[in-house]
Structures are given as C-alpha cells and as structure tokens.
C-alpha cells in the first residue's frame, strides 16, 4: 500500500494488529442521492437485455439490503419485441465492499467483506466486432 | 435499522455517539476471487453497447483503485459492426460503499462514503416524446 504520513491529529490506536482494525464513522457521507434501483432508472425494462431485480436482505450485513440483477432472457430483445437467441443477455458483475457483523450480532464490530453482485445485464455477441 | 441482540462476547465501545463509530477489521473476507475487471470477462468488448474501463485512483480512499465504465458509442453496435444511433448505449450505475480517510492522511480512522460508479453499459430503446 501507499505510505500515508501520520497526522498528529489522528485518533490513536491501541490495537496490536494495527492497522488491521480501524475506527469507522458510520455517519455516511453520500456523494449522490441514494435510491431504490427500480426508481433510479428504467433501464432494467428498456434494455435489449432486460433484467429483474431481486432483493437480498441480511441483517448481519451493512448495507442489509442489496439488489441483485437477473437477466430475463437467454437472448436479446430485437426492435420488433422478439428475442434473438443467437445473442446472449449476460449479467454485468461488480465486486463491492460490505461490512459483516463479527462476532455475529455485535452492533459495533465488523469485518470488511468483498462480495460479487450482478448490477444489470448487457447484450453480447458470440463474435467480437472491431469497430473502426 | 433492525434491532440486533447484544452478544456478551462483543467488543465494548466507549464512544458517546455509539454506534456511529465502530471497529472494522480490514482483513477482508473475500467471497469470490478478486480480479481486474478487464480480465474477469470480455463483455466490455463483445457487448452491443461496449465500454472502456478508466482507472480512478485515490490514496485517501479504500479501495484506492476503482474502475469506471464509459460507453464507447452513443448508439449500439449492430450485427454487421456498424452503430445504430436509433438505440442508446447507457451506463449501468451502482452505489457502492468506500472508506474515506478522516481526518485526511490518518491510517486508522475512516468514514463510510457512498459513491456512484458506472459498472458497464447496456443498450436501451430511446424514450420517444410525442410533441402535441
């Protein structure tokens, strides 16, 4: 990692395993408006590779609610509304950070966890086209 | 939030603003293999709404590196490799949690931050506005 100069105004850490365990302020600074993904855009319905959104809830995790995308079709929707099965609807996945209560049920102790979530779907061709 | 029963084996918190500030173990539990998004799949190239991946680096943030998707075209790529501008390539966005060093440069003190990232692109039918 990058060496960060220690600021004299930093909170002190008594932890032997420092910096494995850190203090985190849960008062979230939001750089954008948080919304239910269904409200944020209607791409899930208008896409040529539309998807359903499944609610995944876990009280031992922060955030406790995560939305998972599942593609509606094997193929992709054409302009006439029919599905072209020679194309594929595929999920776009992303690794995200969540906080997992550890030990379980503890309100003030967490461990960072990486999970893979499907965010939406895209339509792919079995062949790669190089567009000039 | 959901009320979590207090476990007697939980670490104690002396913080007046409890549970605003919590202890987080940075020893990440990875539920999947972490990879560079370019290696994980070639969807960014094979999609009818292909995208480029831009590296966004910030040493004051954890994770310090985030990949941002930018759609390559306004329209969508057809089977013949040409772009159909009657359709739109749009970014699929997701809100993710990151840790922001606070105060700045402090190695063991963070604040949770929500940021909006573009994960990939999908091809959508444009909304037609009917002018009276």
């Amino acid at each position: 990692g990058i060496a960060i100069p220690r600021n004299s105004g930093c909170p002190n850490s008594e932890d032997k395993n420092f910096p494995r365990t850190v203090m985190v302020n849960l008062n979230i600074h939001n750089r954008n408006t948080s919304t239910n993904p269904k409200r944020s855009s209607d791409y899930y319905n208008r896409s040529t590779s539309p998807w359903n959104l499944h609610r995944n809830e876990d009280p031992e995790r922060y955030p406790s609610v995560i939305w998972e995308a599942k593609c509606r079709h094997l193929g992709c929707v054409k302009a006439d509304g029919n599905v072209d099965y020679h194309m594929n609807s595929v999920p776009i996945q992303q690794e995200i950070l969540v906080l997992r209560r550890e030990p379980r049920h503890c309100p003030n102790s967490f461990r960072l966890e990486k999970i893979l979530v499907s965010v939406g779907c895209t339509c792919v061709t079995p062949i790669v086209h190089h567009v000039a | 939030g959901i009320a979590i029963p207090r476990n007697s084996g939980c670490p104690n918190s002396e913080d007046k603003n409890f549970p605003r500030t919590v202890m987080v173990n940075l020893n990440i539990h990875n539920r999947n293999t972490s990879t560079n998004p370019k290696r994980s799949s070639d969807y960014y190239n094979r999609s009818t709404s292909p995208w480029n991946l831009h590296r966004n680096e910030d040493p004051e943030r954890y994770p310090s590196v985030i990949w941002e998707a930018k759609c390559r075209h306004l329209g969508c790529v057809k089977a013949d490799g040409n772009v159909d501008y009657h359709m739109n390539s749009v970014p699929i966005q997701q809100e993710i949690l990151v840790l922001r060093r606070e105060p700045r440069h402090c190695p063991n003190s963070f604040r949770l931050e929500k940021i909006l990232v573009s994960v990939g692109c999908t091809c959508v039918t444009p909304i037609v506005h009917h002018v009276a």
Partner: nanobody, 124 residues
Amino acid sequence: EVQLVESGGGLVQAGGSQRLSCTASGTIVNIHVMGWYRQAPGKQRELVALIFSGGSADYADSVKGRFTISRDNAKNTVYLEMNSLKAEDTAVYYCAAEIGYYSGGTYYSSEAHWGQGTQVTVSS
C-alpha cells in the same frame, strides 16, 4: 427458486451418438423456452438448439440435420439427441431456460436460468 440439472455428457467416438437431458425444478409456473448452448475451449458460448413452449425449435446452422431437440412438458425436461458427432462438437454443453416462477412471494414472468454444464468430448 429454480434449478436446472443436466445429465448425459461424456466421451464418445467421432460419428457416434450421445443424448443429453436436463430437468428444471423449483417454484415454476411456466417454461417459455428450454434448450442448449455450448462453449468450446477458447471460444464464446454459442446457441446449439432451443425448443419453445409451442413446440417449435431453433438450431445453430452447424448442428442442423445432426442434432434433435425434444421436450417433455409434464416432466419439465428437455433432451438433445446428438448424432454424427464431430471433433468440433467437443465442448461444455449448458442447459438453459427462460422460466416464469415465484421467488420470495414475487412472481417473475420471465428469467434466464442456466445449468452447471456437462462435458461432451468427441475423440477422432
């Protein structure tokens, strides 16, 4: 939830035959389409054959006349009869279906589901 379970893969001689089957189970309301895709080493996943709820079928050009897809609606099962097999048919074969089903009290009118895949190896 929905599960697709394949069976019937394995090693076969060139010119020989093989039959794959796949059964869908779970909180299924209806199956719109069922079929098979395949992925050969270093290649992209491609369509092999699909059968629709009305009984019509769609085949990849490379398998037309050699492969036959059929379906038992009562058993939520799809079959792929593969004849005159060639070395280029070697791939992992994935069962796939578009299914309307219930999950957590919500009805999803259509969702794509995939099996784990079964290896078919054609030796020349």
